[in-house]
Interface confidence: low
């Protein structure tokens, strides 16, 4: 018989069958059965640890102690559960790329942190821009081609909606300022409208200057739902606003409806990899 759940690991979870629970009660579901927030399910003679975290689609990237980047802290915990190993959040934002790689693929490349090295004329080019030392006036050139990139609408930290992550990178490069993915899908808000601006992007008319502050203040007004609301949101996170009687659901990517019960086929998924976006 296996001596611990780690002996029962499968790619999707852990599966221990064929043991006699009269002789060995090790595999009864209790608080210690599934480590790293795995959900213990006992079905007949089988105990399985499942790591089906209901992570929302918020793009609040974090860097794990394993050097991997995750879309948000929930996905990091899900990975820790699946790997059955401790992964800590070591910093906010994607894991830093090698200094001076110039790839422009890092989500937080040129994040505006004060550099502690001597700057040359080319160091002023950030956010994926390439330095052209032969140019007479324009030092920083953005050679980013988004023409072959899939449609995958995203809401960015400048309050504008973009057709894909490449366009956000392109805008960030052209403006030489940090523009990040804030969430999947177009920017939307019950109280706001979107207007198409001159550059062809959709801009929220009332968007606050600092999207981070807006997001933080919104979160401060939401508290997790009481336990008796378990199951209220089928594919999402239940939140109780201090201004509302009834709780609301923040749906996972790909789901919609009051209880996140409907599949939203219009959403393509963006999964941030360690450094670059991967489209799946």
């Amino acid at each position: 018989f296996p001596t611990s759940l780690s002996d029962c690991q499968t790619p999707t979870g852990w599966n221990c069958s064929g043991y006699d629970d009269r002789e060995n009660d090790l595999f009864l579901c209790d608080t210690n059965t599934c480590k790293f927030d795995g959900e213990c399910l006992r079905i007949g003679d089988t105990v399985t640890c499942v790591c089906q975290f209901k992570c929302n689609s918020d793009y609040v990237p974090v860097c794990g102690s394993n050097g991997e980047s995750y879309q948000n802290e929930c996905y990091l915990r899900q990975a820790a559960c699946k790997q059955q190993s401790e992964i800590l959040v070591v910093s906010e934002g994607s894991c830093a790329t090698d200094a001076g790689s110039g790839s422009g693929d890092g989500v937080h490349e040129g994040s505006g942190e004060t550099s502690q090295k001597e700057t040359s004329t080319c160091d002023i080019c950030q956010f994926g821009a390439e330095c052209d030392e032969d140019a007479e006036d324009v030092w920083c050139v953005c050679n980013i081609d988004c023409s072959q990139t899939n449609f995958n609408p995203l809401c960015a930290s400048d309050g504008k909606s973009y057709d894909n992550a490449c366009q956000i990178k392109e805008a960030s490069c052209q403006k030489q300022e940090k523009i990040e993915v804030m969430s999947l899908g177009r920017c939307q808000d019950n109280t706001t409208t979107t207007t198409k601006s001159e550059d062809g992007h959709y801009a929220r008319t009332d968007y606050a200057e600092n999207a981070n502050k807006l997001e933080e203040s919104a979160r401060e007004h939401h508290i997790p739902c009481p336990e008796h609301y378990n199951g209220f949101c089928m594919h999402g996170k239940c939140e109780h606003s201090i201004n509302m009687q009834e709780p609301s659901c923040r749906c996972d990517a790909g789901y919609t409806g009051q209880h996140c019960e409907k599949k939203d086929y219009s959403v393509l998924y963006v999964v941030p990899g360690p450094v670059r976006f991967q489209y799946v």
């Epitope: 974090v62 102690s65 050097g67 910093s91 502690q116």
Partner: antibody, heavy 120, light 107 residues
């Protein structure tokens, strides 16, 4: 401004339980961050003991795991340390501290520290 | 546990000197390293977090660098108020651990 203040007996007898409290002002301990206890034996270095997070979950240093409990009283906005079966080796200055921010466990706000001597 | 080996354990320097303190982790800690300054009878004060980010209000003469296993705290021009003990801390893995400290004394 955020302030942390440790309190508790300065003298504890061997084999007894050391109990300290950290009163926090200027920020609600349930709103965010990680709330740690760190100790420093006289003339020696720092040792992280454990923390309680804003959601009430704990992490402890395995070297103390069987003896340490960190709890909180949200109504008083304070968190507490209990260390059982103390010996002279537990004589130290005990600090409470707050984590810098979500996703970063370095500590930016510290109490002034309180010396606890274990002696009969 | 991850060991943080700090060197030197003590050093003597003069005002205006450039001072470098190193910290070596026993395994990869990415950039999850902080540096603290502690003066006698006082609580430690955060100087650097995430290996290279200066904490609010910390003078620009303090800088941090490194990733993986090797980290450095540099004081570009030592000031009278900088004489103290400095500690590195890793927070990549539980339990969080500190280096043994470097005491910076007046020459």
């Amino acid at each position: 401004d955020v302030q942390l203040q440790e309190s508790g007996p300065g003298l504890v007898k061997p084999s007894e339980t050391l109990s300290l409290t950290c009163a926090v002002s200027g920020y609600s301990i349930t709103s965010g961050y990680y709330w740690s206890w760190i100790r420093q034996p006289p003339g020696k270095g720092l040792e992280w003991m454990g923390f309680i997070s804003y959601d009430g979950s704990n992490k402890y240093n395995p070297s103390l795991k069987n003896r340490i409990t960190i709890s909180r009283d949200t109504s008083k906005n304070q968190f507490s340390l209990k260390l059982s079966s103390v010996t002279a080796a537990d004589t130290a200055v005990y600090y409470c501290a707050r984590g810098l921010r979500r996703g970063d466990y370095s500590m930016d706000y510290w109490g002034q520290g309180t010396l606890v001597t274990v002696s009969s | 546990d991850i060991q943080m080996t700090q060197s030197p354990s003590s050093l003597s320097a003069s005002v205006g000197d450039r001072v470098t303190i190193t910290c070596k982790a026993s395994q990869n800690v990415v950039t999850a390293v902080a540096w603290y300054q502690q003066k006698p009878g006082k609580a430690p004060k955060l100087l650097i977090y995430s290996a290279s980010n200066r904490h609010t209000g910390v003078p620009s003469r303090f800088s941090g660098s490194g990733s993986g296993t090797d980290f450095t705290l540099t004081i570009s021009s030592l000031q009278p108020e900088d004489f103290a003990t400095y500690y590195c801390q890793q927070y990549s893995s539980y339990p969080f651990t500190f280096g043994g400290g470097t005491k910076v004394e007046i020459k």
